[in-house]
């Protein structure tokens, strides 16, 4: 690829690159659906080293519309040249190829969590990969949101060291018998547009009930 | 080779906007960063933002967002920065500059705009 | 935000004579993938900048090899062998390793 040449392919694709579960995760789409590959494979080399394009192992000939890079990309300055190309059979469909840099491109998508409900509390337990890189960590905050009756609360538990194991935050000074719901998401240092998972909700019991609610998935 | 030509010198009106341009020449717009630079006059130098003029994403210093907005035209090789509600503290010349094969490390840049904040 | 400190703040020097600025860092600039993102520009008197050098130590083409950078970590370094007329107007360095990125004040040569 001649990076100061017209550019290599035409945009027939759209990528997105996300920190998933702490993974890097490239996702794409095709611009025109009548094109229906049987599958892909996705290559990619680093602009400040022009070498031969890389086949990504996990991503040759793959029937997926989504390749895991964490154990590749791993510099957030780097621009990383990518190209996918579509192959019907053994017929190439097309090629269409993106420059990503971690630190602009990268979104961030919420962590898996469960909620549970007691009388006048919610635990909230967040689940994290048991390690994380350090390059992965992108100075990123976990946000608790509580909603209860139009009115959104948002916490912002302090995380000792990295993003790893499980976290329980309790939600606490809550009204028994009320019904409340909760959003977990990940704050970026910069405030991109962030991705907030879908509400998790609880009724909590009375208050002369001591035993836990069940959370509603 | 590769240039970046800014557009023409700006007098404008407090409370209004302005919208500098960088057209983009000499390398494949989509596949390189472009960055915004801010210098007020006899001071040094500040960074206001990045672009992916490939994907549209961008990257704002805290201290310019709501102020600076930056998008990329790539039919055009155009990147443009959009300044809103503008005080005397925003009269000042306005550098976009090219990223190397690196974030961060701007290797070519434009001749600068001029912008004064005067009513 | 990164603060850079650079010293002095003018430096006045006999063409053929050697320069050195200083460029101190309030945090480490050594990122996580080993690189270190600190670069020097030149602004010359009425122009846009110029960068000079780029990963401490690299020199842009076209940069007389008259130009060296060095350091790491917090502490940096431009050195011009020997000056040369051409080579007055300000120099910055900044680093593009933590966002903000930010730059140092600025060192003014003047040829004596």
């Known amino acids: 690829i001649s990076y100061d040449s017209p550019d290599y392919t035409d945009e027939s694709c759209t990528f997105k690159i996300s920190l998933r579960n702490f993974r890097s995760i490239l996702s794409w789409e095709l611009k025109n659906h009548s094109i229906v590959p049987t599958h892909y494979t996705l290559l990619y080399t680093i602009m400040s080293k022009p070498e031969d394009l890389k086949v990504v192992k996990n991503c040759a000939n793959t029937t997926r519309s989504f390749c895991d890079l964490t154990d590749e990309w791993r510099s957030t300055h780097e621009a990383y040249v990518t190209v996918l190309e579509g192959f019907s059979g053994n017929t190439t469909l097309f090629s269409c190829s993106h420059n990503f840099w971690l630190a602009i491109d990268m979104s961030f998508e919420p962590p898996e969590f469960e909620i549970v409900g007691f009388t006048n509390h919610i635990n909230v337990m967040v689940k994290f990969p048991s390690i994380v890189e350090e390059e992965l960590q992108f100075d990123l905050s976990l946000v608790i949101e509580e909603q209860s009756e139009g009115i959104v609360k948002k916490h912002k538990p302090e995380i000792k060291g990295n993003m790893s194991g499980n976290f329980t935050y309790i939600i606490d000074k809550l009204i028994p018998n009320t019904n409340y719901c909760v959003s977990v998401y990940l704050e970026h240092s910069d405030e991109q547009a962030v991705i907030k998972s879908p509400l998790k909700c609880t009724l909590l019991p009375p208050g002369q009930e001591s035993e836990s609610a069940e959370s509603a998935k | 080779q590769v240039q970046l030509q800014q557009s023409e010198a700006e007098l404008v009106r407090p409370e209004t906007s302005v919208k500098v341009s960088c057209k983009a020449s000499?390398?494949?717009?989509?596949?390189?960063?472009i960055e915004w630079v801010k210098q007020r006059p006899g001071q040094g130098l500040e960074w206001i933002g990045v672009i992916n003029p490939g994907s549209g994403n961008t990257k704002y210093n805290e201290k310019f967002k709501g102020k600076a907005t930056l998008t990329a035209d790539k039919s055009s090789s155009t990147a443009y920065m959009q300044l809103s509600s503008l005080t005397s503290d925003d009269s000042a010349v306005y550098f976009c500059?090219?990223?190397?094969?690196?974030?961060?490390?701007?290797?070519?840049w434009g001749q600068g705009t001029s912008v004064t904040v005067s009513s | 935000d990164i603060v850079l400190t650079q010293t002095p703040l003018t430096l006045s020097v006999t063409i053929g004579q050697p320069a050195s600025i200083s460029c101190k860092s309030s945090?480490?600039?050594?990122?996580?993938?080993?690189?270190?993102?600190l670069n020097w520009l030149l602004q010359r008197p009425g122009q846009s900048p110029k960068r000079l050098i780029y990963?401490?130590?690299k020199l842009d083409s076209g940069v007389p090899d008259r130009f060296t950078g060095s350091g790491s970590g917090t502490d940096f370094t431009l050195k011009i062998s020997r000056v040369e007329a051409e080579d007055l107007g300000v120099y910055y360095c900044?680093?593009?390793?933590?966002?903000?990125?930010?730059f140092g004040g600025g060192t003014k040569l003047e040829i004596k």
């Open positions: 945090q480490s600039l050594l990122d996580s993938d080993g690189k270190t993102y």
């Open positions: 000499g390398y494949s717009f989509r596949n390189y960063l």
């Open positions: 500059a090219r990223d190397g094969y690196y974030l961060g490390t701007m290797d070519y």
């Open positions: 990963l401490v130590s």
């Open positions: 900044w680093q593009g390793t933590h966002f903000p990125y930010t």
